[in-house]
């Protein structure tokens, strides 16, 4: 079928990076500057995306692939293909209409983007707070209060608060 198609349609022989030029007897012509074709058999080349202003070029346009943009330092992408750039904040902050604001007590944000989220409520899982939360970090939940009561474990003492990853054996 592929051979039949190429006999009937000379354009199918045009590789990526070229287009089938109807103005020149369907000769395969290279894509003009600032355009590309990522597949063979194209009748036109697509215009390259331009990265300007708040966007910077992450990947240059070539004759076979489009340019890719990301955001200039201090900004992060929104949308699947980086259609918009939003200002970074510090960890422990969120971006509001009035700019970057510290997370309210009881909430945290460990990234430069996104919103402040409530600390985990350890008691909902029957656990106690091992390490207190901050604006930048969630609380660390430890063993349940019952596990920490005197005599509950006669072999291994409860882990000190400075080792949040370690729990009694």
């Amino acid at each position: 079928f592929e051979r039949t198609r190429s006999l009937q349609d000379p354009c199918s022989n045009c590789p990526a990076g070229t287009f089938c030029d109807n103005n020149r007897n369907q000769i395969c012509s290279p894509c003009p500057p600032n355009s590309f074709s990522s597949a063979g058999g194209q009748r036109t080349c697509d215009i390259c995306r331009q990265c300007k202003g708040v966007f910077r070029t992450r990947k240059e346009c070539s004759s076979t692939s489009n340019a890719e943009c990301d955001c200039t330092p201090g900004f992060h992408c929104l949308g699947a293909g980086c259609s918009m750039c939003e200002q970074d904040c510090k960890q422990g902050q969120e971006l509001t209409k009035k700019g970057c604001k510290d997370c309210c007590f009881g909430t945290f944000n460990d990234q430069k983007r996104g919103i402040c989220r409530p600390w985990t409520n350890c008691s909902l899982d029957g656990k106690s707070v091992l390490v207190n939360g901050t604006k930048e970090r969630d609380v660390v939940c430890g063993p349940s209060p019952a596990d920490l009561s005197p005599g509950a474990s006669s072999v291994t003492p409860p882990a000190p608060a400075r080792e949040p990853g370690h729990s009694p054996q």
Partner: antibody, heavy 115, light 107 residues
């Protein structure tokens, strides 16, 4: 709060120049660029040009010979100047912060070109 | 320059109806299309960026879709406050270009 406030004349004589100032607050012109867009009454939007955070400019080729966009970072002001105005330049002119998708617009300056 | 063509030019709707507005690009612009709402005597407001991403605070009755050359804005349950002009624009290549707009009116 991000704000762009425009000031400029409402009436311009044919063949004269139009000057509009866009004063911004809530962000710095050393971080963000600013675009200019116009809208003739009852018509669509038309991109005119932009000045980027570093001070370089891009203009719509249809206006490059009579358009100038400059800025003063310390005063948080952008200056838009268009020469040789004609009747069909009558429009609302907007400054818009550059974030890739035009989320923050000025209130607009209605400009009528008439003798 | 990339030409953005919107259709229809205007449409009359009743509250509660579903509306589809269309925008066609003369070239492949990927998903780099934004939709704006403009009420009388106001500046345009961003509704959708990147063809389908709702901007902060935009009600979820507004949905954008499409890629390459064909894009739609759907308002699933039109409210009286949605009566306005709607503009599409491409942010893919310079000069940036916009459609002529669609006016949404009340029946």
């Amino acid at each position: 709060q991000v704000q762009l406030k425009q000031s400029g004349p409402g009436l311009v004589q044919p063949s004269q120049s139009l000057s509009i100032t866009c004063t911004v607050s809530g962000f710095s012109l050393t971080t963000y660029g600013v675009h200019w867009v116009r809208q003739p009454r009852g018509k669509g939007l038309e991109w005119l040009g932009a000045i980027w955070s570093g001070g370089s400019t891009d203009y719509n080729a249809a206006f490059i010979s009579r358009l100038s966009i400059t800025k003063d970072n310390s005063k948080s002001q952008i200056f838009f100047k268009m020469d040789s105005l004609k009747a069909d330049d009558t429009a609302i002119y907007y400054c818009v912060r550059d974030d890739g998708s035009f989320a923050n617009w000025g209130q607009g300056t209605l400009v009528a070109v008439s003798a | 320059n990339i030409v953005m063509t919107q259709s229809p030019k205007s449409m009359s709707m009743s509250v509660g109806e579903r509306v589809t507005l269309r925008c066609k690009a003369s070239e492949n612009v990927g998903t780099y299309v934004s939709w704006y709402q403009q009420k009388p005597e106001q500046s345009p407001k961003l509704l959708i960026h990147g063809a389908s991403n709702r901007y902060t605070g935009v009600p979820d009755r507004f949905t954008g879709s499409g890629s390459a050359t064909d894009f739609t804005l759907t308002i699933s349950n039109v409210q009286a406050e949605d009566l306005a002009d709607y503009h599409c624009g491409q942010t893919y290549s310079y000069p940036l270009t916009f459609g002529a707009g669609t006016r949404l009116e009340l029946k």
